[in-house]
């Protein structure tokens, strides 16, 4: 018998969509075969309608698309509006059409039931509103309106224009009977539930005069939306409940294996742990929609999601929801990368951030999550250059090493910058990832002076000091400005005496201007690097003043003064719901990237030896 | 919680015909699933069929040792599944579970069935 299994019968009605998931061995022969569906006619010959490498027969064209997870061994094909014409036979199967590896697979797509003549039909989703309408004869105006549902062979009255109404129907039916002229009255009733599926009668009046009208509704359990994202990437559910609980709190949950449904997050500020640092509720519009962003995608998030609306912010039966089937692709065209990054108080970090390398003239952003209420995470910087103005110094975005990834550098650490951070383009909304920023004990690794006033005219020496471990780096001084850091000549001065157990590795890099000019005033880094992956850097504040005393000044960082007071901006920050993360050769150190080419202006020198090791303190 | 109750079994000749019931309650609402398993002394449990289904689409899944001979069906309104079983043999004699699940991977694994029964004997003589 053949080691492929799936549903032998599939049965729905016109309009709908199935999800027809079939197994195979995991082998690693099978994972990579080529998946189909087809279907069986009368020769016995299987017509593939569409397989896992991109065909799609015209019939199938905009309905239909398959979808492979090789590491649970099973494809899946999704089929939407149904008509009767796909009933009929199919196989689902591994590699050739004729070939044995296959699943006999039956679909019937019927019409759904017989209704009596005139019957009007209602379908309507379970939680929301529905409005019957039910038409009568001038005679009847001043009868009894009343409507009935039909259960079995008996009538069961539910409401009625003498005010009855059935308890089951109570505080969520109303009948309205409309001024004279208006030969319609509508019964409406709220939060819909499941057990409200069937057939109504409308009636007004009694006796053989009596108006009937047959209404047959259909309450509908939310059908999951099926979702498939890669490991560690991103998923948005748009959740839209109807303007009746637009302003009624709203939630995601999960189900879990008791059958209820754990909030994630929910709008009177709840949020599952498990979520922390990845999850954003992204405020409702006037008519009541909201969406959820997770970043950080991880098998474990696997499952079935309702957002639903409810005052307690969790799920009630007979309120609106909608539905979601979560898949997480382990075979993820998303990197690997670190989670969380190490840097030491004092120190600097590097994060690499992934993109989708099909789009590196997407706008890249980075920004800080918020947990507070609903989770927001306000920019910082982005590509084109604009900074937090209490990040100015200390913060870049650079485009290397391209192809796929960019890196954010944030160095002068404290134990405030702890947190989580997002990666985002505004292109695919797949790519955001979080990353976390730990703060440890330690020391940072290169040594620079404090605050550094320069005089007009003079030449200014700056001093880095790299520890031997570092021996093996290209060390390099630039210029930072909001739109980068701007790569400055550096003079390598031989073996630092800040370092005792490796003087002859160690290295003392200077920056020196000469002259010091009014445009030389800003921040400065040194910094590590190999090749276009940058490791630590240390930032230095120089103030330019008029010229008082005669002679050159060298800085040493025994005359350092403390950094100076970072500017802070008013929060009115435009927030993102995007992306973030980084590259997988990185896992143990950050790196930088940028060559940011010349410096107009300034300085002159050269730059010392390059080359990589690992990290130490203020990295990961 | 979902309480799973099943009925019908009974002693059977081997050529009839038997239908088992499996009546669910509490908080059905999510169940995505529901199934049959048995097991026969001294085996292990096996799987025998499964019923899954998304608003008003059904899935059918059936061991290739029941294929043609037993059916599953579903009755949304009595929150009840159904096993009709035909040309009955002397190797389906075991005890049938009902089990229900909220999301399968796999229909054929008993592990990822949240709910179960407590069986009901299925034997038949030859």
């Known amino acids: 018998k053949s080691p492929v299994f799936g549903p032998q019968e599939v049965s729905s009605v016109e309009g709908n969509s199935v999800s027809i998931k079939c197994y195979y061995p995991p082998t690693s022969v099978n994972r990579h075969t080529r998946k189909y569906w087809c279907r069986k006619g009368a020769s016995g010959r299987c017509i593939t309608l569409v397989s896992s490498e991109g065909y799609v027969s015209s019939n199938y064209a905009g309905r239909a698309n398959l979808t492979n997870f090789p590491e649970n061994g099973t494809f899946v094909v999704n089929i939407a509006q149904l008509s009767r014409d796909d009933s009929g036979h199919y196989k689902c199967g591994l590699g050739i059409n004729s070939r044995g590896l296959s699943f006999d697979v039956s679909l019937e797509v019927s019409q759904g039931p017989e209704l009596p003549n005139g019957t009007e039909v209602y379908t309507v989703d379970v939680g929301r509103t529905v409005t019957i309408k039910c038409p009568f004869k001038t005679e009847n105006a001043p009868k009894t309106k009343a409507l009935y549902k039909k259960i079995g062979q008996t009538s069961v009255l539910v409401i009625d224009s003498r005010n009855y109404v059935n308890p089951n129907y109570k505080d969520r039916i109303r009948l309205r009977i409309p001024g004279t002229g208006q030969l319609i009255f509508t019964v409406v009733i709220d939060r819909l539930r499941l057990s409200d599926h069937g057939l109504y009668l409308c009636q007004a009046g009694d006796g053989s005069n009596r108006d009937e009208k047959n209404a047959d509704l259909q309450v509908l359990e939310p059908e999951p939306e099926l979702v498939y994202e890669d490991l560690r990437g991103s998923v948005t559910f748009h959740c839209a409940l109807g303007l009746e609980v637009a302003n009624v709190a709203k939630f995601l949950c999960r189900v879990n294996s008791r059958e209820t449904c754990d909030v994630v997050i929910n709008t009177l500020g709840k949020r599952d742990s498990a979520f922390e640092g990845r999850i954003l509720l992204n405020p409702q519009d006037k008519d009541g929609s909201f969406s959820v962003v997770i970043t950080g995608l991880r098998k474990e998030d696997e499952g079935r999601y309702l957002c639903g609306a409810h005052s307690d912010g969790q799920l009630q039966e007979g309120w609106p929801i909608q539905a979601w089937q979560l898949f997480v692709n382990e075979e993820s065209t998303i990197p690997r990368s670190p989670t969380v990054v190490k840097g030491v108080a004092g120190g600097s970090v590097a994060v690499l951030c992934p993109y989708n390398p099909k789009e590196s003239q997407s706008l890249k952003y980075w920004c800080l999550w918020e947990g507070a209420q609903n989770g927001r995470c306000p920019l910082l910087v982005e590509s084109q250059g604009l900074v937090q103005e209490q990040y100015e110094g200390r913060l870049s975005l650079l485009q290397e090493p391209g192809n796929g990834t960019f890196t954010v550098i944030l160095n002068q650490l404290t134990t405030q910058d702890a947190g989580f951070y997002w990666c985002l383009t505004n292109g695919d909304t797949r790519w955001r990832t979080t990353v976390e920023i730990k703060i440890i004990e330690g020391e940072p690794n290169l040594k620079v002076p404090g605050n550094v006033t320069a005089v007009l005219g003079e030449t200014l020496n700056i001093p880095c000091h790299f520890p031997c471990k570092f021996s093996s780096y290209e060390k390099y001084w630039c210029k930072w400005s909001n739109t980068g850091c701007q790569t400055l000549p550096s003079q390598d001065e031989g073996p630092s005496e800040a370092f005792v157990n490796c003087d002859e590795n160690s290295r003392l890099v200077s920056l020196t201007l000469n002259p010091v000019t009014r445009a030389d005033e800003g921040w400065y880094w040194c910094g590590v690097k190999q090749g276009h992956f940058y490791g630590e850097t240390a930032a230095v504040y120089v103030a330019v003043e008029e010229k008082k005393v005669a002679g050159s000044r060298y800085v040493s960082p025994a005359k350092a003064d403390a950094a100076p007071d970072e500017k802070v901006l008013d929060s009115g920050v435009r927030e993102i719901e995007n992306k973030a993360i980084q590259d997988p050769r990185l896992f143990a150190e950050e790196k930088v990237v940028a060559d940011t080419g010349d410096q107009a202006g300034g300085s002159r020198a050269s730059v010392d030896s390059s080359s990589s090791e690992e990290q130490g303190g203020s990295s990961k | 919680e979902v309480q799973l109750v099943e009925s019908g079994g009974g002693l059977v000749q081997a050529g009839d015909s038997l239908r088992l019931s499996c009546a669910a309650s509490?908080?059905?609402?999510?169940?995505?699933?529901v199934g049959w398993f048995r097991q026969a002394p001294g085996k292990e449990r096996e799987f025998v069929t499964t019923?899954?289904?998304?608003?008003?689409?059904?899935?059918?899944y059936y061991a290739d040792s029941v294929k043609g001979r037993f059916t599953i069906s579903r009755d949304n309104a009595k929150n009840t599944v159904y096993l009709q079983m035909n040309s009955l043999k002397p190797d389906d004699t075991a005890v049938y579970y009902c089990?229900?699940?909220?999301?399968?991977?796999?229909?054929?694994?008993?592990?990822?069935?949240?709910?179960w029964g407590q069986g009901t004997q299925v034997t038949v003589s030859s």
């Open positions: 089990a229900a699940s909220t999301v399968l991977t796999d229909p054929r694994v008993p592990t990822e069935y949240d709910y």
């Open positions: 509490g908080r059905t609402f999510t169940t995505y699933g």
């Open positions: 019923i899954t289904w998304s608003g008003s689409t059904n899935y059918k």
